[in-house]
């Protein structure tokens, strides 16, 4: 069965910036996908972008890079402008198109732990600092000890007494012992900074594999449209976009004048052609 | 929940007539056309007519002069006219709303179940 897996990040360096994954995992063509947020495509949903294995991306504010990853993946680079953050409580919506076979679409949104309020990388410093001191508070008691036995055998040294050589070859044993564990606790300084991640997400999280990352499939849905094709042609679409209620093609942000429903589309706004001769429509 | 729902399709003889019907409804997307495309047995997929956000229809040669598109603003459906009807026309019928890339095409992300047509005599 068909599968959408959808991976919401924020960028460790930028708390403002966030980053869509999703992927497809099943056989057949894509012929289109669409990411949304606030909900699932034709539910409630806001697209951000679409994409067309052929003809290129579209996006709409605030998505700032839309892009094919492998053949059934992509990701999508959003700029938030807010201070508040909105991206951190919201659902991302991920719809993968196979037509005339169907569509799968499934939602994630981002973990809890890389919320910025409750994020973990400035926790660590104090409780670092705290073994810090205890650890430079101990080498300090091993240092004052071996200082002070040393003053002790060198006391002990200028007296003519005939057991003194022995005692100075214990010195340098006891002395090498004194050390040993100031050692380990430097080694033990050196291992909270080597073993304490920081970074949200792996650095190479987008050269990995789709089946490594966090599939979230909440609201995973499958639409069966159509019957199965033998042929599909992939297929999707640029340029402006109608925002449709309840059925109607209408302007943004303006209601139809009309109490009836209906199809009113709205002026083009879309971009530079993609492909210059492609077989479609005319 | 977005719903295509095709109708009109049939046995008819060549140089027949048929209109197709589709009936949308629980559309809330960002969308930039609607129009037909069809699928022949044993082929592939070939967008026939759509209407783009400028109003304007747009047709593939093979069918321009033949069909007709257009749109009922009070019954929120959109149709299709096909008068001339050739064998080459028999093909599942598909209703589509979609994205534009380019000025003509139209790119399906959300479609119906189809409807049959055959022109045969």
């Known amino acids: 069965t068909p599968e959408v897996w959808v991976q919401v990040q924020m960028e460790a360096t930028e708390l403002s910036s966030f980053t869509v994954h999703c992927g497809f995992l099943g056989p057949g063509s894509i012929s289109l996908v669409t990411v949304s947020w606030g909900g699932p495509d034709g539910a409630g949903g806001t697209k951000l972008a679409v994409l067309h294995p052929e003809l290129g991306t579209r996006q709409w504010a605030p998505a700032r890079q839309a892009r094919w990853e492998t053949q059934s993946s992509i990701s999508l680079a959003l700029e938030d402008s807010g201070a508040s953050s909105p991206f951190a409580n919201t659902t991302f919506c991920c719809k993968f198109a196979s037509f005339p076979e169907g569509s799968w679409e499934s939602c994630g949104s981002l973990p809890p732990s890389s919320d910025p309020g409750l994020s973990a990388p400035p926790t660590p410093v104090p409780i670092l600092r705290a073994d810090l001191a205890g650890i430079l508070g101990l080498s300090g008691v091993l240092l004052f000890g071996c200082g002070y036995l040393l003053h002790l055998l060198r006391r002990q040294k200028h007296r003519p007494t005939p057991r003194l050589q022995p005692s100075h070859t214990n010195s340098q044993a006891l002395t090498a012992q004194a050390w040993a564990p100031s050692q380990a606790s430097q080694a033990a300084l050196h291992d909270p900074y080597a073993t304490i991640n920081t970074s949200f997400c792996p650095a190479t999280l987008d050269t990995a594999h789709p089946n490594g990352w966090a599939s979230l499939p909440t609201h995973a849905a499958h639409q069966p449209q159509g019957p199965a094709a033998s042929a599909s042609t992939p297929i999707l679409a640029r340029g402006s976009f109608v925002s449709v209620e309840n059925g109607l093609y209408t302007q943004a942000g303006e209601r139809p004048p009309h109490t009836g429903p209906g199809l009113t589309l709205f002026p083009d706004c879309r971009g530079p052609r993609a492909v210059e001769g492609r077989f479609g429509v005319r | 929940e977005v719903q295509l729902v095709e109708s009109g399709g049939g046995l008819v003889q060549p140089g027949g007539s048929l209109r197709l019907s589709c009936a949308a409804s629980g559309y809330t997307s960002r969308t930039d056309c609607m129009g037909w495309f069809r699928q022949a047995p044993g082929k592939g997929l070939e967008g026939v007519a759509h209407i783009d956000s400028d109003g304007i229809p747009r047709y593939v040669d093979s069918v321009k002069g033949r069909f007709t598109i257009s749109q009922d603003h009070a019954k929120n459906s959109l149709y299709l006219q096909m008068n001339s009807l050739r064998a080459e026309d028999t093909a599942v019928y598909y209703c589509?709303?979609?994205?534009?890339?380019?000025?003509?095409?139209?790119?399906?992300?959300?479609w119906g179940q189809g409807t049959m047509v055959t022109v045969s005599s």
């Open positions: 589509v709303v979609g994205f534009k890339f380019d000025e003509d095409y139209c790119a399906p992300n959300d």
